[in-house]
């Protein structure tokens, strides 16, 4: 959401979020690292192009023209400098002058050594328990952000991992239309549209960077779960990894796993939608997970096949009208899982990414809650690996990523909600090894062609 330094009455009233980097002669003397030439405080650029008509409530949601409902000035960083105050480096760069290239490797979780697996699990658990050093979350909408007295900013601290959950929740929540009115649910700033892949890419990149900084380990990388096994078992659901099934309750995680101790955030949907409050940092019940356990829906009891990945990578157009969950011949809609793996839309189909979520049959299968199950991270790194392979094969052809008339939040130049500092979809539509400082260690299945007899 926003840097702690900007969650103040002064910053919110002024609309300026340009924190100092190294103020030598008092507050406001080194905004955005300006004294060392790292950046400057500038007007926010926000996409004002039209969105599709399925969202008819313009003016009612803080996420419109993000982040202008809160701030209209932010740091613009020079060169490879980046961050809320230009104090860090753009992805793929490190060093005091952000002039050293870095490339980290995201690997298959199952290929890691015992120590590496343990390291990853412990790092996730540390992220769940460590307060985010930079960001705080809003617990009220902009009209109530200064509290009942108009002088008390409504923000809370949150852990690094719960911040990851909260940002996802905030991007998918309904539009509150007022007490006594039903909230509007046909809105999603991170799914069912072209921004699905770019949004989740940045989401992971932010978590990875936060964990690198928490550990002070620049080479730390998020592994992936190759969920395209065609199996009806979760191969990473073991106690040394993401947790096996509890013997006492088949919908819970084994007490031998640290994840059985995790408690979820953002589960009070009823309150958010009727009272207009936002998810806060309060933790509730345990993670629910019952892989392959949805007997009422046999189609989600088995994971995608390896060939589904090979097929989806042959869909050459990134997206197609109406740029929604009913698009046909859209790579994005195919990997998201609303089309079959060949790209054909079918309302009954749930494939690839969607199928993997639904297979988990619990917390991980509910959009507003799904990142609470840490398998979400691994599921999305694999999805991002597929995206990166598509970008490599098709030279990051952005021509079918619409500049306008996509669902709200999904235009090419829209600032992805609720990330800070503002970052557009375009900035994530690039090959990761050359532009974002990470690569995947992965072998892609080649498509098998049946030879006629």
């Amino acid at each position: 959401q926003f840097p702690r330094q900007c969650a103040t009455v002064e910053a919110l009233r002024s609309g300026m979020c340009c924190p100092d980097l190294s103020p030598v002669s008092g507050p406001g003397t080194d905004r955005c690292g300006s004294s060392s030439g790292r950046g400057r405080c500038e007007a926010v650029t926000a996409d004002s192009r039209p969105h599709s008509p399925q969202y008819p409530h313009d003016g009612r949601d803080d996420r419109e023209v993000w982040p202008l409902r809160f701030f209209n000035r932010t740091c613009h960083c020079n060169g490879n400098f980046s961050g809320h105050n230009c104090g860090t480096c753009r992805p793929g760069w490190r060093g005091a002058a952000c002039d050293q290239r870095v490339l980290i490797v995201r690997r298959n979780l199952l290929d890691l050594s015992k120590e590496e697996k343990n390291h990853f699990v412990r790092a996730l658990d540390m992220a769940k328990r460590t307060t985010h050093p930079l960001f705080v979350i809003a617990t009220r909408r902009s009209e109530e952000i200064l509290g009942p007295d108009g002088n008390t900013p409504q923000f809370e601290n949150i852990s690094i991992y719960n911040y990851f959950v909260w940002t996802h929740y905030y991007s998918v929540k309904k539009t509150f239309l007022g007490v006594g009115q039903e909230s509007f649910g046909e809105v999603d700033f991170s799914h069912e549209g072209p921004a699905f892949l770019t949004w989740h890419r940045y989401h992971l990149l932010r978590l990875e960077k936060d964990m690198q900084e928490m550990l002070q380990e620049p080479s730390f990388s998020l592994p992936y779960w190759n969920f395209a096994t065609g199996k009806n078992v979760c191969d990473i659901c073991t106690d040394d990894l993401m947790g096996s099934r509890s013997n006492f309750d088949s919908t819970l995680i084994s007490p031998n796993s640290v994840f059985s101790q995790w408690r979820v955030v953002c589960d009070s949907l009823e309150d958010y939608d009727t009272l207009g409050t936002l998810c806060n940092s309060t933790e509730d019940g345990p993670i629910r997970r019952n892989p392959a356990g949805n007997v009422a829906r046999p189609m989600v009891q088995r994971l995608p096949e390896p060939q589904d990945v090979a097929q989806c990578l042959e869909v050459g157009l990134f997206d197609t009208p109406p740029f929604y969950s009913n698009s046909t011949n859209s790579f994005r809609n195919t990997v998201e899982g609303y089309s079959d793996p060949t790209g054909k839309y079918d309302p009954a189909v749930r494939s690839l990414h969607n199928l993997a979520h639904l297979f988990l049959n619990g917390t991980g299968g509910q959009t507003h809650l799904s990142p609470n199950d840490p398998i979400f991270v691994l599921l999305h790194t694999f999805t991002d690996a597929v995206f990166d392979e598509w970008l490599r094969r098709y030279n990051a052809d952005i021509s079918t990523f619409p500049l306008e008339n996509a669902p709200i939040g999904h235009n090419r130049q829209y600032n992805m909600v609720p990330f800070w500092p503002p970052v557009t979809n375009t900035e994530m539509f690039v090959t990761a090894p050359d532009n974002l400082g990470y690569t995947y260690e992965i072998q892609w299945p080649s498509r098998e062609f049946s030879v006629p007899e």
């Epitope: 050594s113 120590e115 390291h119 050093p133 550990l215 002070q216």
Partner: antibody, heavy 119, light 107 residues
Framework: QVQLVQSGSELKKPGASVKISCKAS????????MNWVRQAPGQGLECMGW????????TYAQGFTGRFVFSMDTSVSTAYLQISSLKAEDTAIYYC????????????WGQGTLVTVSS | EIVLTQSPATLSLSPGERATLSCRAS??????LAWYQQKPGQAPRLLIY???NRATGIPARFSGSGSGTDFTITISSLEPEDFAVYYC?????????FGQGTKLEIK
């Protein structure tokens, strides 16, 4: 070049406290975690834990909780190790070492600070 | 917790001879193992990292090998300045574990 200069030897009585310093230069202090390693006389190396020099968050190894405190002052690029209620068995050389080139090993070390606890 | 066991505890050799020091981990540490040299009154000095890579400025006579649980550091032809204590080290949950050391002494 990377340099770590530790404070001088200390002779303390049991029950007293000691605070040793480790001043870093030649790199951005807040970019790399600082580790503390203990070596009792004639013994091997023992990792005590580390401090995140960006956030100040310490992590202590088993056996080093309670009487041992890691702290820092970023304005002077210095990490500190404080030991309270000193015991004879705390007599050792204490080293600081940043996780510099890689988080998996330690390629730069301070020269060590000898703390002697004796009545 | 992973335990590193070094052998032998003491190795007596003459200058010019070949020295082979071993380190065994109680469970696999992949190739994340380092070797350090420590001389009396000095801080440890990194020799080998990631099991087989020589650190900056380390002479070619030092080499490391192994992966998983069994590791070796070899000094092809001992020089007088090589007589010291050698430690292997691995990392677990951001904390470093060292072997008990091998003392390489002049015969």
């Amino acid at each position: 070049q990377v340099q770590l200069v530790q404070s001088g030897s200390e002779l303390k009585k049991p029950g007293a406290s000691v605070k040793i310093s480790c001043k870093a230069s030649g790199y951005t202090f807040t970019s790399y975690a600082m580790n503390w390693v203990r070596q009792a006389p004639g013994q091997g190396l023992e990792c005590m834990g580390w401090i995140n020099t960006n956030t100040g968050n310490p992590t202590y190894a088993q056996g080093f909780t309670g009487r041992f405190v890691f702290s820092m002052d970023t304005s002077v690029s210095t990490a500190y190790l404080q030991i309270s209620s000193l015991k004879a068995e705390d007599t050792a050389i204490y080293y600081c070492a940043p996780r510099y080139s890689s988080s998996w090993y330690l390629d730069y070390w301070g020269q060590g600070t000898l703390v002697t606890v004796s009545s | 917790e992973i335990v590193l066991t070094q052998s032998p505890a003491t190795l007596s050799l003459s200058p010019g001879e070949r020295a082979t020091l071993s380190c065994r981990a109680s469970q696999s540490v992949s190739s994340y193992l380092a070797w350090y040299q420590q001389k009396p009154g000095q801080a440890p000095r990194l020799l080998i990292y990631d099991a087989s890579n020589r650190a900056t400025g380390i002479p070619a006579r030092f080499s490391g090998s192994g992966s998983g649980t069994d590791f070796t550091i070899t000094i092809s032809s001992l020089e007088p300045e090589d007589f010291a204590v050698y430690y292997c080290q691995q990392r677990s949950n951001w904390l470093y574990t060292f072997g008990q050391g091998t003392k390489l002494e002049i015969k």
